[in-house]
C-alpha cells in the first residue's frame, strides 16, 4: 500500500509523459490523477517505467475502477497487463478482438500464463462461442490452443471456425478431442468435392468412425501412412484388407514398416492370413486359414 501524501508544489502531472519516470512511487501516487491516466493509457507503454512504478499506476486504476476496467483502458494496458492477476481479469468484459490481440501481443513468445488463459476464457464466454476470427487469432499466438480445450469446450466451436485450423494446431490433440472436432470438420467441409474434401479433413481423421473410413476407401484418396497411424484403433479394426488397400492406395506398402505398431499390429491380428497374403507385403500374424472367426462386437452391443 502506498501512503496518501500531498503532491509537492509544481509536480502535479498535466499529462502522462517521460518526466514521470523520475517520480518516486509516492509522488506518482500523489501527483498523477487516475482519470488522466485512464484517458492516456496508450502513452504508458512508450515510457520506460520500473516495475515498482507500474505497480503504483495499476493501484490507481484499481481505485478508479473497483468493478473492473472498461475496455477503452484494457485495450491500451500494454505491459501493465503483465501486472494483472487472474482475479483482476475476471472482472473485465472484453468484447473486441483488437483488444484481445493487443494483450496477447504483450505476452508473445511466452507460455500461456494464467492471466492469458483467464483473458481468453472471458473473451470466448463473452462471445458465446469460439468463432473463426477468434480461433484464427488464438492459434496464431498459441498453436496448441485448440488442444488445450476440454471436449466440452470444443463442443461449442462452430463448424465455420474449423476453416481456421491448421494441421499443426491439432498435433497435441488426444482422441477425445478429435472425436468432437471431426464431426465439426465434416460439417464445415461438406460442400467440397471429393479430393479437396480429403485434403481438408485429413488432419481430423483421428476422430473418424469406421463407417466414414469405409466410405473414404471408395474415393481413391491414397491416405498416407502418417495419417493412417493416427486413426482410432477401434475404427480401423473392422476394416477389411481390401478396404485398407483402397484407403492407402500406393501407400499400402508402408504397412510392412509399421506392422509392430498400433493400429496396424492390432488390425493384422484381426485379418485372415490368406487375405493379408494378397497384399504381397509379407505381413504375418493374421488368423490362420481354416480357423473360425467369431465377431463378438454384436454380442457386446447386446449385453
Amino acid at each position: 500500500e502506498v501512503e496518501k501524501t500531498a503532491c509537492p508544489s509544481g509536480k502535479k502531472a498535466r499529462e502522462i509523459d517521460e518526466s514521470l519516470i523520475f517520480y518516486k512511487k509516492w509522488e506518482l501516487e500523489a501527483c498523477v490523477d487516475a482519470a488522466l491516466l485512464a484517458t492516456q493509457m496508450d502513452r504508458v507503454n512508450a515510457i520506460p517505467f520500473t516495475y515498482e512504478q507500474l505497480d503504483v499506476l495499476k493501484h490507481k486504476l484499481d481505485e478508479l475502477y473497483p468493478q473492473g476496467y472498461p475496455e477503452s483502458v484494457i485495450q491500451h494496458l500494454g505491459y501493465l497487463f503483465l501486472k494483472m492477476s487472474p482475479e483482476d481479469i475476471r472482472k473485465w468484459n472484453v468484447t473486441s478482438l483488437e483488444t484481445l490481440k493487443a494483450l496477447l501481443e504483450v505476452n508473445k513468445g511466452h507460455e500461456m500464463s494464467p492471466q492469458v488463459a483467464t483473458l481468453i476464457d472471458r473473451f470466448v464466454k463473452g462471445r458465446g462461442q469460439l468463432d473463426k476470427d477468434t480461433l484464427d487469432t488464438l492459434t496464431a499466438f498459441y498453436p496448441g490452443y485448440l488442444c488445450s480445450l476440454s471436449p466440452e469446450e470444443l463442443s461449442s466451436v462452430p463448424p465455420s471456425s474449423i476453416w481456421a485450423v491448421r494441421p499443426q494446431d491439432l498435433d497435441t490433440c488426444d482422441p477425445r478431442q478429435l472425436d468432437v472436432l471431426y464431426p465439426k470438420a465434416r460439417l464445415a467441409f461438406q460442400n467440397m468435392n471429393g479430393s479437396e474434401y480429403f485434403v481438408k479433413i485429413q488432419s481430423f481423421l483421428g476422430g473418424a468412425p469406421t463407417e466414414d473410413l469405409k466410405a473414404l476407401s471408395q474415393q481413391n484418396v491414397s491416405m498416407d501412412l502418417a495419417t493412417f497411424m493416427k486413426l482410432r484403433t477401434d475404427a480401423v479394426l473392422p476394416l477389411t484388407v481390401a478396404e485398407v488397400q483402397k484407403l492407402l492406395g500406393p501407400h499400402v506398402e508402408g504397412l510392412k514398416a509399421e506392422e509392430r505398431h498400433r493400429p496396424v499390429r492390432d488390425w493384422i491380428l484381426r485379418q485372415r492370413q490368406d487375405d493379408l497374403d494378397t497384399l504381397g507385403l509379407g505381413l504375418q500374424g493374421g488368423i490362420p486359414n481354416g480357423y473360425l472367426v467369431l465377431d463378438l462386437s454384436m454380442q457386446e452391443a447386446l449385453s
Partner: antibody
Framework: EVQLVQSGAEVKKPGASVKVSCKAS????????VQWVRQAPGQGLEWMGI????????TYAQKFQGRVTMTRDTSTSTVYMELSSLRSEDTAVYYC???????????????WGQGTLVTVSS | SYELTQPPSVSVSPGQTASITCSGD??????ASWYQQKPGQSPVLVIY???RRPSGIPERFSGSNSGNTATLTISGTQAMDEADYYC?????????FGTGTKVTVL
C-alpha cells in the same frame, strides 16, 4: 425396417422446458448422425442442430444456441432434444432425422421420425 | 443470414414435367438436397448432393445445381407427386431450408 420413433405430443407453459425423445428401432447396432428439424403450423422446415454418433459432438443453429441441448443414450439407441425457455413461437412439430447414407461428406436426412407436436400455451 | 428462395407454387398436368427452382447466393458452390412432404407426413429425401437419388426414389426425380440456382425436375409427373418440396443447403454454421414449393398435379 429401420424406424425412428418419437415421444408423444406435449403441452407446455411459456418459460418451461420440453424434452423430446427419438428412439431408433431396427438396425440399432449402427449409430448415425441425428439432426432435429422443426415445423411451425402451416410454415416451412427449420433446422435446429445435429449430434454425432457417439454423442460427444453437437452443433446447434445460432438461433437456438443456449436454449437447445441434444444428447444421446447409446445403450438405448435414443437421442434427446431439450428446448428451454419456451415461448408461444416454439409451438411446432419437432422431427428427428438420421443421416444413414453412405456419403462421407454429406448429412442428408434420409430416415425421419413421425414428429412430435409441442404446443406452448398459457 | 443465408436465404433460399423457392416459388410458392407450381402446377403441372399428369405426365408433364415439373421444374422447381431454388435460388441462393452462389448456391452452385454448395451441395443442395431436396425433400418432399405430403400433408400430415414427415419429409422424405428425394435428392442429395445436387443430383443423387436415394434408393427407393423413382427415376423421374432428378436434380441439378449451378450458379445461383438449384433445380428439382419431376419428369412424367404423377398424382402421387403432389406435395410440398423444400430445398436445403449448408451455409457457414447452419442448414438452411428453402421457403417451400407446393406442387399441384392438375
Amino acid at each position: 425396417e429401420v424406424q425412428l420413433v418419437q415421444s408423444g405430443a406435449e403441452v407446455k407453459k411459456p418459460g418451461a422446458s420440453v424434452k423430446v425423445s427419438c428412439k431408433a428401432s431396427g438396425d440399432t447396432f449402427k449409430r448415425y448422425y441425428v439432426q432435429w428439424v422443426r415445423q411451425a403450423p402451416g410454415q416451412g422446415l427449420e433446422w435446429m442442430g445435429i449430434i454425432n454418433p457417439s454423442g460427444v459432438s453437437t452443433t446447434y443453429a445460432q438461433k437456438f444456441q443456449g436454449r437447445v441441448t441434444m444428447t444421446r443414450d447409446t445403450s438405448t439407441s435414443t437421442v434427446y432434444m431439450e428446448l428451454s425457455s419456451l415461448r408461444s413461437e416454439d409451438t411446432a412439430v419437432y422431427y428427428c432425422a438420421e443421416s444413414r447414407g453412405s456419403g462421407y461428406n454429406y448429412f442428408a436426412m434420409d430416415v425421419w421420425g413421425q414428429g412430435t407436436l409441442v404446443t406452448v400455451s398459457s | 443470414s443465408y436465404e433460399l428462395t423457392q416459388p410458392p407454387s407450381v402446377s403441372v398436368s399428369p405426365g408433364q414435367t415439373a421444374s422447381i427452382t431454388c435460388s441462393g447466393d452462389k448456391l452452385g458452390d454448395k451441395y443442395a438436397s431436396w425433400y418432399q412432404q405430403k400433408p400430415g407426413q414427415s419429409p422424405v429425401l428425394v435428392i442429395y448432393q445436387d443430383n443423387r437419388r436415394p434408393s427407393g426414389i423413382p427415376e423421374r426425380f432428378s436434380g441439378s445445381n449451378s450458379g445461383n440456382t438449384a433445380t428439382l425436375t419431376i419428369s412424367g409427373t404423377q398424382a402421387m407427386d403432389e406435395a410440398d418440396y423444400y430445398c436445403q443447403a449448408w451455409d457457414s454454421d447452419t442448414y438452411v431450408f428453402g421457403t417451400g414449393t407446393k406442387v399441384t398435379v392438375l
